[in-house]
């Protein structure tokens, strides 16, 4: 019979043979005759392939470098490759997630509309009228202006996107 | 019919290195890696590693790394293993094997090299 | 590393009597495969993927198991069956073997 030129899934050509690819988790070390199986031999320790493959190498799992703010967020297997994210108060830059920058503050006037994750940073929003952030946080949102009225006070001061209003007492001359 | 022929056994001083063999023979060297397993005198069978015999890829058991390379010569259908800085702890059997046409299993083992290391 | 416990360690039976030995795994694996080993002779494969007997291998033998948990069974001791009994995993590197059953003849 002619010799193949394409083969089945899970199946690679070598030698105008069609050879079984190695499952996940495994490494190619012989490649199949017509007498004989391909051989493979499962990946070591801090190793992976997470394909059905005919690498003669396994890759080496991601290090989570600590020094970078890494740290291991799932345990890679033979299968899979270690998946790192950042310490508290961190997140990643990219999404390969290879180094981690520290969480964005929202500055006066800005109030946070996300809270950061291990990979996307603080988002933040102006605040609008009513509301005012004071401080410069990577927690705090907007906060509403207080209500003078609900306290039997009146608006001394006038609130900014930056302070709250000042309440004071009425009054008392305007009966 | 297939055979794995290891080389004569070995008397050795400590701190010294010594290189082993398995000649394979009945089959194609290159169709089948080579195996390497530890038998010390407690009986216990320790897999230090395998090399492809086509690829010349070798696989360590992290235990035996700096300890064992395995090497192979396909001109003469030998795989070596070599041991480097011996001590008593290394004083074993060494056996080559590999596996069967078909299967994770090993079907074929060579005779076993005894290492003695001694001052 | 994948630790395979086998037990017993020593055991002696008679002739006739129905033998067990257990491998148990630290982790899960597909398969188990047993050696046999007599003094001054290298491990022969006797089992190969938890319950197929190798070339040569009597039929008072079988294997079973799955998971973490494998035994070797012998239905009838016989004298020429007393050896050192290894299990073996092939299913994550490093490949590892258990410390062995010596079987006996009483």
């Known amino acids: 019979p002619e010799p193949p030129t394409a083969c089945r899934e899970k199946q690679y050509l070598i030698n105008s043979q069609c050879c079984s690819l190695c499952q996940p988790g495994q490494k190619l070390v012989s490649d199949c005759t017509e007498f004989t199986e391909t051989e493979c031999l499962p990946c070591g320790e801090s190793e992976f392939l997470d394909t059905w493959n005919r690498e003669t190498h396994c890759h080496q799992h991601k290090y989570c470098d600590p020094n970078l703010g890494l740290r291991v967020q799932q345990k890679g297997t033979s299968e899979t490759d270690t998946i790192c994210t950042c310490e508290e108060g961190w997140h990643c830059t990219s999404e390969a997630c290879e180094s981690c920058v520290l969480h964005r503050s929202c500055s006066p006037g800005f109030g946070v509309k996300q809270i950061a994750t291990g990979v996307s940073d603080t988002i933040c929003e102006p605040c609008p009228v009513g509301f005012f952030s004071n401080v410069s946080s990577a927690f705090e949102k907007c906060h509403p202006w207080t209500s003078c009225e609900t306290k039997d006070l009146v608006v001394q001061q006038a609130g900014t996107n930056k302070t709250d209003v000042v309440c004071g007492p009425q009054d008392r001359l305007r009966a | 019919q297939v055979q794995l022929q290891q080389s004569g056994a070995e008397l050795v001083r400590p701190g010294v290195s010594v290189k082993i063999s398995c000649k394979g023979s009945g089959y194609t060297f290159t169709d089948h890696a080579i195996h390497w397993v530890k038998q010390s005198h407690a009986r216990r069978l320790e897999w230090i590693g395998a090399i492809s015999t086509n690829y010349g890829a070798a696989t360590y058991n992290q235990k035996f790394k700096g300890k064992a390379t395995m090497t192979v010569d396909k001109s003469s259908s030998t795989a070596y293993m070599e041991l480097a800085r011996l001590t008593s702890e290394d004083s074993a059997i060494y056996y080559c094997a590999r596996r069967g046409s078909h299967g994770d299993w090993f079907a074929y083992w060579g005779q076993g090299t005894l290492v003695t290391v001694s001052a | 590393d994948i630790e395979l416990t086998q037990s017993p360690a020593i055991m002696s039976a008679s002739p006739g009597e129905k033998v067990t030995i257990t491998c148990s795994a630290s982790s899960s694996v597909s398969y188990m495969h047993w050696f046999q080993q007599k003094p001054g002779t290298s491990p022969k494969l006797w089992i190969y993927s938890t319950s197929n007997l190798a070339s040569g291998v009597p039929v008072r033998f079988s294997g079973s198991g799955s998971g973490t948990s494998y035994s070797l069974t012998i239905s009838s001791m016989e004298a020429e069956d007393a050896a050192t009994y290894y299990c073996?995993?092939?299913?994550?590197?490093?490949?590892?073997f258990g410390a062995g059953t010596k079987l006996e003849l009483k």
């Open positions: 073996h995993q092939y299913h994550r590197s490093p490949l590892t």
